[in-house]
């Protein structure tokens, strides 16, 4: 069945919220004054071989629970990210984009990235599927 | 009872080789990063770098980038310090220690007991 | 790198005094709101221990005789009642910028 614009609209929604999620998310550990950086950079990601389609997001999807873990280092009293609630919101997008009766392998690519190549690499991919859209 | 076990003390020539171990037990290993730091005889607390044992990512104070070698074998629940070539000046005690740093925090909760190297011809 | 400066450096003390101890930090430490500053005593031939995390939180099994203080550059530890076994040397550590870094230490001796 063809897209409709209203599920077009929903899906554009979908991944603007992602998008903002990751970005606050990268915006609030890539700070050369954040102390914990250094080490938060010691945690390695699986990066996708390839994310050109939303079903690409079950890289993500595989990836959240790691994710949850950095991002527990990262609080402070003026930076509620509050991890597990972030993650959920996260996830429920992704399953909703992707689709959850898919059952699509994730290809991981060799190498390991840190959290701010990771973030980046998504934050790339949702900006590109959402200028498709529009 | 969390706790991290070091290797025994070690007497070693200038130029040889030298890898110290940091066994940790009672806590899940790769959830926590583990921190080297020296005290030279007499002296204060130096910090030389960090591992990720889940990882294996690394992360080193610059003053002792190049001088030596931040591992972990998590199958073990071990990480080591090692150095290819050894100085009269390397003389120390070296502890490993546990990184706490989720929420508000970041400090060393458990330490090892420290293992005294000593570099003398 | 952030120094850190203790004062005293040492000094002789008997049991029952209030003792204070303070770090002074070239720059602040403090982040989004918290103090990256963390206190650790140290007895002869034995390994560093916690006793104050984020300037002022005691680690659990510190007695309460022990309490931390402070914020940007300056930091205190005190302790109400000098025990016996509190005769030790005493570090503040800065966790809040690469390399973290110790103070010099404060030798707390038996007058």
């Known amino acids: 069945m063809a897209p409709t614009s209203s599920s077009t609209k929903k899906t554009q929604l979908q991944l603007e919220h992602l998008l903002l999620d990751l970005q606050m998310i990268l915006n609030g550990i890539n700070n050369y004054k954040n102390p914990k950086l250094t080490r938060m950079l010691t945690f390695k990601f699986y990066m996708p071989k390839k994310a050109t389609e939303l079903k690409h997001l079950q890289c993500l999807e595989e990836e959240l629970k790691p994710l949850e873990e950095v991002l527990n280092l990262a609080q402070s009293k003026n930076f509620h990210l509050r991890p597990r609630d972030l993650i959920s919101n996260i996830n429920v997008i992704v399953l909703e984009l992707k689709g959850s009766e898919t059952t699509f392998m994730c290809e991981y690519a060799d190498e390991t990235a840190t959290i701010v190549e990771f973030l980046n690499r998504w934050i790339t991919f949702s900006q590109s599927i959402i200028s498709t859209l529009t | 009872e969390v706790q991290l076990v070091q290797s025994g003390a070690e007497v070693k020539k200038p130029g040889e080789s030298l890898k110290i171990s940091c066994k940790g037990s009672?806590?899940?290993?790769?959830?926590?990063?583990i921190e080297w730091v020296r005290q030279m005889p007499g002296k204060g607390l130096e910090w030389m770098g960090v591992?990720?044992?889940?990882?294996?990512?690394?992360y080193y104070n610059e003053k002792f980038k190049g001088q030596v070698t931040i591992s972990a074998d998590k199958s073990i629940s071990t990480a080591y310090l090692q150095w290819s070539s050894l100085k009269a000046s390397d003389t120390a005690m070296y502890y490993c220690a546990r990184w706490r740093g989720e929420g508000y925090y970041a400090y060393y909760d458990v330490w090892g007991q420290g293992t005294t190297v000593t570099v003398s011809s | 790198a952030i120094r850190l400066t203790q004062s005293p450096s040492s000094f002789s003390a008997s049991t029952g005094d209030r003792v204070t101890i303070t770090c002074k930090a070239s720059?602040?430490?403090?982040?989004?709101?918290?103090?990256?500053m963390n206190w650790y005593q140290q007895k002869p031939g034995k390994a560093p221990k916690l006793l104050i995390y984020s300037a002022s939180n005691l680690e659990s099994g510190v007695p309460s005789r022990f309490s931390g203080s402070g914020s940007g550059t300056d930091f205190t530890l005190t302790i109400s009642s000098l025990q016996s076994e509190d005769f030790a040397t005493y570090y503040c550590?800065?966790?809040?910028?690469?390399?973290?870094?110790f103070g010099g230490g404060t030798k707390v001796e038996i007058k």
């Open positions: 720059q602040s430490v403090d982040y989004q709101g918290d103090s990256y």
């Open positions: 591992i990720n044992p889940g990882s294996g990512g690394t």
């Open positions: 009672g806590y899940a290993f790769t959830n926590y990063l």
């Open positions: 550590q800065q966790s809040n910028e690469d390399p973290y870094t």
